[in-house]
């Protein structure tokens, strides 16, 4: 069975931010900002054709 | 630190999971500069079907 | 047309060190990838490592990561890979490969290949 | 490490017959498998990518198929001038490992 997308599951560490408990909140400034940067950034590592998009945003403490 | 993880969605054939991780490690020095976001750790795998069918990419 | 032509056929003793080079035509040099195979006598193909001319990024096979090291230099469109601490067993023919563009994931063209012969 | 595992090392056959090589991977590799013909003291030529599309000048005897981690070549006619080894390769994630060969015979 074949969708014609593929998916991959990324995860990385962000060193000069703190986590705190608004980053579990999804309507908190800071939740929303670095979502925003996050998908911006995305957005330009993969300018090719090929890049559809991400989901599934999560952040947790490092 | 913050450990951000996501999913990425990709049309079928166009990309492997080498240059997925090769291309945003390459990325790094541009996210400090741009986004101030210092990147370290990354690991990428592919997502099996069955769970990327859930998913859905936004 | 594209073409990749590989420097000659080298002997060395153990413990030397050798450089092959490949010179590219025919394409803008720069945009492409450039791997590296290494082929034993009478043997399969072993992928040692890449190099993107354009960013001088490398990526090695972690077996060869202490064996050669790749180069590139874009004025002269040619690609190098230098093998240090020779042994017997890096007697093989040592072939360049370009990959193709773009979600092109192949080798579409090969260097004619460069023996390197180890003994003493 | 992806290993790649291919089937069978040698192979006699008619001119003429249908022949069958088969790489199989020791991971998904998403059809990101490709199909060398490499003849003696030449250097390896690009037969088959994305598991079956054919690179052109290839002839149509020459097909791919597969996907997840089983994949087969196939020369649906066998001709004299196919007498080569063949290599599958795959290019889905590093080490981008070979198969170890199939050497093709004519009977």
């Known amino acids: 069975l074949s969708t014609g997308v593929s998916f991959f599951f990324l995860s990385f560490h962000i060193s000069n931010l703190q986590f705190n408990s608004s980053l579990e909140d999804p309507s908190t400034d800071y939740y929303q900002e670095l979502q925003r940067d996050i998908s911006e950034m995305f957005l330009q590592i993969y300018k090719q054709g090929g890049f559809l998009g991400l989901s599934n945003i999560k952040f947790r403490p490092g | 630190s913050v450990v951000v993880q996501l999913t990425l969605a990709f049309r079928e054939g166009t990309i492997n999971v080498h240059d997925v991780e090769t291309q945003f490690n390459q990325y790094k020095t541009e996210a400090a500069s741009r986004y101030n976001l210092t990147i370290s750790d990354v690991s990428v795998s592919d997502v099996p079907f069955p769970f990327s069918a859930q998913s859905g990419a936004g | 047309q594209v073409q990749l032509v590989q420097s000659g056929a080298e002997v060395k003793k153990p413990g030397a060190s050798v450089k092959v080079s490949c010179k590219a035509s025919g394409y803008t040099f720069t945009t492409y990838t450039m791997h590296w195979i290494k082929q034993a006598p009478g043997q399969g193909l072993e992928w040692i490592g890449y190099?993107?001319?354009?960013?001088?990024?490398?990526h090695y096979n972690q077996k060869f990561k202490d064996k050669a090291t790749l180069t590139a230099d874009k004025s002269a469109s040619t690609a190098y890979m230098e093998l240090y601490s020779l042994r017997s067993e890096d007697t093989a023919v040592y072939y360049c490969a370009r990959q193709g563009n773009y979600a092109a994931y192949y080798f579409d063209y090969w260097g004619q290949g460069t023996l390197v012969t180890v003994s003493s | 490490d992806i290993q790649m595992t291919q089937s069978p090392s040698s192979l006699s056959a008619s001119v003429g017959d249908r022949v069958t090589i088969t790489c199989r991977a020791s991971?998904?590799?998403?059809?990101?498998l490709v199909w060398y013909q490499q003849k003696p003291g030449k250097s390896p030529k690009l037969l088959v990518y994305n598991a079956k599309t054919l690179t052109d000048g290839v002839p149509s005897r020459f097909s791919g198929s597969g996907s997840g981690t089983q994949y087969t070549l196939t020369i649906s006619s066998l001709q004299p001038e196919d007498v080569a080894t063949y290599y599958c390769q795959n290019f889905w994630n590093v080490p981008f490992t070979f198969g170890s060969g199939t050497k093709l015979e004519i009977k």
């Open positions: 991971g998904n590799i998403h059809n990101f």
């Open positions: 190099i993107n001319p354009g960013s001088d990024y490398t």
